[in-house]
Interface confidence: low
């Protein structure tokens, strides 16, 4: 009795395997292996067994172990099964555009691969299996016909082979063809809907929206938007089977007048178009004039607003009397008017629509400098060694510079936290100075010693 181990082996093409041949008797007359494969005996063996390494196994083979024992000669075969994955898995090209509702035939060719009994060919839509067939013939050709629906647009169809060796080597080898993407389409007979401003101002931005329902597949639709000779660059938002193209448009003085706005939606090899008229106008902002933008307090100031000859203006919310393109009023400047805004609003009618423009100017009032008791107290009494912050605020426009000095040299640290010492006591002369002049004020600091508390 001759034994062989392992009795069955599955191995990759070109691989190697160790095979043990053994005899049932202790001292066989002969023990060996017959095989066309390259073999190498692995030494040392035993009295009644030998180990061989078979290499470069390219195809299925049945090496035979033989032994000659006193009770007779016998042999045993090991079954070597070679596996290799297909060399080519290819899906035939799909039509460029496929009408919804028509059947599509998928065809896959597979070259090579073994063992064929474990090789399955699948036609896939994405990862969904459409058909599973055995690989027959060389090359193996597998076909299936599938109905095409809307949900097939953009779907990837591919062909996959599975060499399932899991019962043997716990491995599943997959080869997948390059995917082919299917395109289907449906364009409705209705024209797109176009929403845009009827009037558009020179050098300003307007928004144009073009939309269309009943499109399929909406993601493949292309939109062309143009105003006169100007091509627009829309941002497209997709719904279930609708799209909306939104674009900003800016026009120049050369385009003033009426222009054609065109929206075209293209899908497959068809187009639907809509046209609309847009009036382009020029309307400069009104002018707001002050007799002087910067005046001293008490000065009289004239505020004047002037706009487009056909416009009507309002100055600080008060309409011109009589209504027209010009308005004005007079005021006496006070410190409270410093930074005050004067706003002029102009309204113009263009192609039946009212358009508005605003302009604002600011008045600067020069005043001061000032040093008031409220903001710069004349007397402070603080305990010695306490933490205090001397405060003195000067007012004016332009903002005055403030210095407080004792005996012309010792500064009072305005706005800083200090520890009160005897040195701080005394009378300080605070001086606020700006380009408009200067004011002074005396500030007395009294320090209470602990012994007087």
């Amino acid at each position: 009795q001759t034994s062989v181990f392992p009795p069955e082996v599955i191995l990759p093409r070109g691989g190697s395997v160790k095979v043990n041949c053994s005899a049932s008797c202790d001292q066989p007359i002969s023990l060996g292996m017959e095989t066309p494969l390259p073999k190498k005996e692995i030494l040392p063996g035993g009295n009644n067994w030998k180990m061989y390494e078979l290499s470069n196994v390219q195809e299925d083979s049945q090496p035979m172990c033989y032994s000659n024992c006193p009770d007779g000669q016998s042999s045993a075969k090991t079954l070597l099964t070679v596996y290799w994955t297909p060399e080519r898995v290819e899906l035939a090209p799909l039509p460029p555009w496929q009408p919804v509702g028509k059947n599509l035939t998928l065809r896959c060719q597979v070259e090579g691969g073994a063992p064929r009994a474990n090789l399955t060919v699948m036609l896939l839509r994405g990862e969904k299996e459409l058909s599973r067939q055995s690989a027959v013939g060389e090359p193996a050709e597998v076909t299936t016909t599938v109905p095409v629906g809307r949900d097939d647009h953009g779907a990837n169809f591919s062909c996959r082979t599975e060499l399932d060796l899991r019962p043997y080597v716990l491995k599943l080898f997959e080869n997948t063809s390059a995917p082919h993407q299917l395109q289907t389409f449906d364009l409705p007979a209705t024209p797109p809907q176009l929403v845009s401003p009827q009037v558009l101002e020179v050098d300003t931005q307007g928004t144009v929206v073009c939309s269309l329902d009943g499109l399929f597949p909406v993601s493949e639709a292309q939109v062309s938007l143009a105003l006169g000779d100007q091509k627009l660059n829309p941002t497209i938002t997709y719904g279930n089977n609708s799209l909306s193209a939104k674009a900003s448009v800016k026009v120049t003085a050369e385009e003033e007048g009426t222009q054609q706005l065109l929206c075209g939606v293209m899908l497959g090899n068809q187009t639907q178009e809509t046209r609309q008229t847009v009036t382009i106008y020029s309307f400069p902002a009104p002018n707001v004039n002050l007799t002087k933008p910067e005046v001293s307090e008490g000065t009289e100031v004239i505020v004047e607003c002037e706009a487009h000859p056909r416009a009507k203006v309002m100055l600080n919310g008060v309409p011109a009397q009589p209504p027209g393109p010009r308005a004005q009023f007079l005021l006496k400047a006070t410190p409270e008017d410093n930074g005050r805004s004067f706003s002029c609003s102009a309204t113009l009618e263009v192609a039946g629509q009212l358009v508005h423009k605003n302009q604002t100017r600011e008045l600067r009032v020069l005043y001061g400098p000032r040093l008031d008791e409220k903001d710069c107290p004349g007397n402070w009494t603080w305990p010695e060694n306490s933490q205090q912050t001397p405060m003195c605020q000067a007012w004016g426009n332009p903002l005055p510079q403030l210095k407080c000095l004792k005996d012309g040299t010792f500064p009072l640290p305005i706005g800083q936290s200090v520890t009160v010492t005897r040195d701080l006591e005394g009378t300080y002369l605070c001086q606020a100075r700006s380009t408009r002049g200067e004011v002074t004020r005396e500030v007395t600091v009294n320090v209470l010693s602990p012994r007087y508390e």
């Epitope: 899991r166 019962p167 716990l170 599943l172």
Partner: antibody
Framework: QSLEESGGRLVTPGTPLTLTCTVS????????MSWVRQAPGKGLEYIGW?????SAYYANWAKGRFTISKTSTTVDLKITSPTTEDTATYFC???????????????WGPGTLVTVSS | AFELTQTPSSVEAAVGGTVTIKCQAS??????LSWYQQKPGQPPKLLIY???TLASGVSSRFKGSGSGTEFTLTISDLESADAATYYC?????????????FGGGTEVVVK
């Protein structure tokens, strides 16, 4: 990503019982799914698995006693003719993340208890 | 028939200590071995696969070693949360030989 077993209850010996594992957060078309059981106070016992393509494989001791099947979001384990020895918590588990091995189970359900008693 | 034998069946150690669990296969399974942790009332949790590779999110205090027929799981710097039953599992070969088989388990008690 989660698994949840259901269907565990008290049954009499010989009454077929089907347990269901509901998956969420991943696709059964990409993973092998295993069933493992644990008798009260005992260790884990591997029953079998179903591949992503739907082929079922069983441990030697489990052949003929269990049937594994699946839909797009569930994996079923049918105990064909329960005996008192089948009293256990049954777990479903997902494999296949590491080195493609079905048996490395990196996601488990909480388990469902089956009691077989007359 | 293929078997995985775990020793000891129970082990006790103090917090901060080290525990070693052995798993012996009845035939060579190369490095195709996983380790799982199971706490009462919970499903098992994958700790280690390929004999020594840590699964995602598992503390480096867990260390796996070995190949062929002898495997070891070492837990160092023991924490009270490590109290659980630990199982080894083979994934060599097919389900009818050694694939999927579990060891009998080792209970770790932390003092």
């Amino acid at each position: 990503q989660s698994l949840e077993e259901s269907g565990g209850r008290l049954v009499t010996p010989g009454t077929p019982l089907t347990l269901t594992c509901t998956v969420s957060g991943f696709s059964l078309s990409s993973y092998g799914m295993s069933w493992v059981r644990q008798a009260p106070g005992k260790g884990l016992e591997y029953i079998g698995w179903i591949s992503f393509s739907g082929s079922a494989y069983y441990a030697n001791w489990a052949k003929g006693r269990f049937t594994i099947s699946k839909t797009s979001t569930t994996v079923d384990l049918k105990i064909t003719s329960p005996t008192t020895e089948d009293t256990a918590t049954y777990f479903c588990a997902r494999g296949g993340d590491y080195g493609g091995s079905t048996y490395i189970l990196n996601l488990w359900g909480p388990g469902t208890l089956v009691t077989v008693s007359s | 028939a293929f078997e995985l034998t775990q020793t000891p069946s129970s082990v006790e150690a103090a917090v901060g200590g080290t525990v070693t669990i052995k798993c012996q296969a009845s035939e060579s399974i190369d490095s195709y071995l996983s380790w799982y942790q199971q706490k009462p009332g919970q499903p098992p949790k994958l700790l280690i696969y390929a004999a020594s590779t840590l699964a995602s999110g598992v503390s480096s205090r867990f260390k796996g070693s070995g190949s062929g027929t002898e495997f070891t799981l070492t837990i160092s710097d023991l924490e009270s949360a490590d109290a659980a039953t630990y199982y080894c599992q083979s994934y060599s070969g097919t389900i009818t030989t050694s694939g999927g088989a579990f060891g009998g388990g080792t209970e770790v008690v932390v003092k």
